[in-house]
Interface confidence: medium
Amino acid sequence: QFELEILSMQNVNGELQNGNCCGGARNPGDRKCTRDECDTYFKVCLKEYQSRVTAGGPCSFGSGSTPVIGGNTFNLKASRGNDRNRIVLPFSFAWPRSYTLLVEAWDSSNDTVQPDSIIEKASHSGMINPSRQWQTLKQNTGVAHFEYQIRVTCDDYYYGFGCNKFCRPRDDFFGHYACDQNGNKTCMEGWMGPECNRAICRQGCSPKHGSCKLPGDCRCQYGWQGLYCDKCIPHPGCVHGICNEPWQCLCETNWGGQLCDKDLNYCGTHQPCLNGGTCSNTGPDKYQCSCPEGYSGPNCEIAEHACLSDPCHNRGSCKETSLGFECECSPGWTGPTCSTNIDDCSPNNCSHGGTCQDLVNGFKCVCPPQWTGKTCQLDANECEAKPCVNAKSCKNLIASYYCDCLPGWMGQNCDININDCLGQCQNDASCRDLVNGYRCICPPGYAGDHCERDIDECASNPCLNGGHCQNEINRFQCLCPTGFSGNLCQLDIDYCEPNPCQNGAQCYNRASDYFCKCPEDYEGKNCSHLKDHCRTTPCEVIDSCTVAMASNDTPEGVRYISSNVCGPHGKCKSQSGGKFTCDCNKGFTGTYCHENINDCESNPCRNGGTCIDGVNSYKCICSDGWEGAYCETNINDCSQNPCHNGGTCRDLVNDFYCDCKNGWKGKTCHSRDSQCDEATCNNGGTCYDEGDAFKCMCPGGWEGTTCNIARNSSCLPNPCHNGGTCVVNGESFTCVCKEGWEGPICAQNTNDCSPHPCYNSGTCVDGDNWYRCECAPGFAGPDCR
């Protein structure tokens, strides 16, 4: 059953979810609810696990509600045995472990007309295993906060994570067992089988010819006998015969007849002729003795001075009689001459299947393992041999023993470790089986006996300088306050690095910003704007390139300010009639010195190199395999000695060739088997072993024996506009744009009007790498100053 217990409720203002008061109006002064409190009760809906909880739909696992259990705020944690705050949802199905729970707090209207109103609702999706332990959950958002606890318990005799394993102890015809904590049947002593209803027979009892209904018994089938039902019963009256199957009489050597009672070798069996007489078999049970000289009688037993020849063996004493002699034998011997060892094993005195060994004047029993004593009549203590490996104790049973295993072990000798890993480990953790326990190996970021807990990496407060820590799976993130950066907010941000201030201004770092101290001619946050001195100070036009203005920065009290019409690459030269010309720096040309002279016009780069125009200079980007200022030098690809096993290296363009010796193969003579390996063909080429050589099939954009040379096809036809230079880059290309142009294919005109070069509200007209100022009325000059 699923149980839920309400622990506490906090609804300080006595409000409903919709903002209204439970009991009517609000106090106009403090806006708190007045009059009576909420009459709080709870509804519960339990359903299948939903990753995104939907309020509707059936409560497929059950639903229920409490009576009114309190007002606005109450605490029931101390009240034990009070069932009013408990909802029990029995289930008649296997518990699925994962679930979604909807808990709603309601205000009872105590009115048949007015419906009840919802105060607050909580939803929780999770996984819970059956246990006596409660799991506490909290609803901490919204108008009301409440706390409740849940658990799942199995009915009596039901076990397992799904409460679907049934086990009820019994000791009757149908079974003899108890139940362990996992619901597994543990058989009582002497019983076995899945239902513990098969008796364990006497140890050694023949499985084929014996059986038992009670432990330790061994009942024989018809035709079989013995303690273990392993001996067949021969034909009744069988004398010198044995059986392999019941009722047989298979004669021993020299015996005949239906009951094996006819001696076919009387001489051999009885050796009746004494004193060296020779015996002859004359028929079944018949014989004849021919005696040596000095002896007579049917058995040559009559002798004159018979004791002279020491006829009594084995220390027997001889007495002469009228018939010849008589031997008085020492203990253990018999027969007329004391030569027969008395068979002390007849009858067999050895119990419990012991084997009798005849000795002189005695016998010895060789007992089966479970028995001991002179005649195997005593039960052997098997526990003396310490057969139990991991056990609390060893119990000696009649003809057997029992090991009482330590927790976590099983098997007759407690030598099998029980596998305690039953899927308890969560979040993809792996389980290690221990003795009477298990251990979950958590993936990074999780902890707890079952890896059920996301480790709070923020617990050690790793964020410095007031940074806010956000816990994530197996990591954390610091949200830094203004002025700090770094993964732990450990870096005090230097807003002056790199220096944002232009035109030689000094930068000063502040807690969350920077300040630029501008030189006299510049202004703006980054000192990027030329000051319009004429707005603040009267100035005098000297010529079409220069104005003068009063200044206390110079000894003469006058500062001369030059026009910037010629841009950064030229100087303004005043001409008569208000005109001007520009004197250009090396490498630039054009009216405003805005054009970079093309130093690549003479095509200085060799061997397919690409020329990039600079300022009064150029740079060659060489094709693969070439180097030098003009790409004039073939790179020596043999310099690293790539050929193994005595191979000779020949340098090619951006490649090398190994002349292999002694049966070595491959690009670098590294293999006995194949011309190809993963490094033979470059840039995604596929290698084919052609016996004496290899061949590379190159992807688009590459060619050469090992796909090492970029095809120029990506730059043909030239995709770069406005005089841009195309540089091959594998299957792709890069455009190096001329000044005044930008974008991936140099199609966008750079905005030369940024930042505002025209003063006094003049309008800027952008050209191709130049601009023109159209001045407002009353202003003139290239930059309207």
Epitope: R439, I441, P444, G448, D449
Partner: antibody
Framework: EVQLLESGGGLIQPGGSLRLSCAAS????????MTWVRQAPGKGLEWVSV???????FYADSVKGRFTISRDNAKNSLYLQMNSLRAEDTAVYYC???????????WGQGTLVTVSS | QAVVTQPPSASGTPGQRVTISCSGS????????VSWYQQLPGTAPKLLIY???QRPSGVPDRFSGSKSGTSASLAISGLQSEDEADYYC????????????FGGGTKLTVL
């Protein structure tokens, strides 16, 4: 801030008993795996015992039957009861929090146990 | 008795990259995650690497770990004088009923 502080070490005769304590702050002992690790003078680290949050305990073969690990949830403390001490038990004993992995993310400063006659 | 082997000593000059190896068997390193610890003279060990290659917060990215088969290694790049310490690897050992087994330790000297 997480902290572990061991105490209870000292000089003891062979065959004697000693109880080490480890007071924890900044986290709850009962909901974590807690371990004792020792280091003999001039030697390497040796794992001694662990108690799981569920209460299961495990010991190294060298101390099994002589040492007992336990905890007091109310005091948020870990203990190691050491009986039948031998000269080879001389070491600095550290308590550490063991995360499933296993790895030890927080260690105490250690307490020295000297077993000598 | 299960054994995890580390070289007794290693050395390097400042700025160099040094690697310390840790060799075990299928019952420990082969089937379980490896962690690494730094022990400065006279102090308690400190966690450097867990789960083979994960770095706890506060450990510089100069320290990195890796594992292959029954061996693991700790790499320290841009060696500094304060890295002079003893380094230990550790892993569970299944044959010891889940006991943790430490390597013998490696003394790193910065020349």
């Amino acid at each position: 801030e997480v902290q572990l502080l061991e105490s209870g070490g000292g000089l003891i005769q062979p065959g004697g008993s000693l109880r080490l304590s480890c007071a924890a702050s900044g986290f709850t002992v009962s909901s974590n795996y807690m371990t004792w690790v020792r280091q003999a003078p001039g030697k390497g680290l040796e794992w001694v015992s662990v108690i799981y949050s569920g209460g299961n305990t495990f010991y190294a073969d060298s101390v099994k039957g002589r040492f007992t690990i336990s905890r007091d949830n109310a005091k948020n403390s870990l203990y190691l009861q050491m009986n039948s001490l031998r000269a080879e038990d001389t070491a600095v004993y550290y308590c550490a929090r063991e995360m499933s992995g296993p790895y030890f993310d927080y260690w105490g400063q250690g307490t020295l146990v000297t077993v000598s006659s | 008795q299960a054994v995890v082997t580390q070289p007794p000593s290693a050395s390097g000059t400042p700025g160099q990259r040094v690697t310390i190896s840790c060799s075990g068997s299928s019952s420990n390193i082969g089937s379980n995650p490896v962690s690494w610890y730094q022990q400065l003279p006279g102090t308690a060990p400190k966690l450097l690497i867990y789960s083979n290659n994960q770095r706890p917060s506060g450990v510089p990215d100069r320290f990195s770990g890796s594992k292959s088969g029954t061996s693991a290694s700790l790499a320290i790049s841009g060696l500094q004088s304060e890295d002079e310490a003893d380094y230990y690897c550790a892993a569970w050992d299944d044959s010891l009923n889940g006991d943790v087994i430490f390597g013998g330790g490696t003394k790193l000297t910065v020349l």
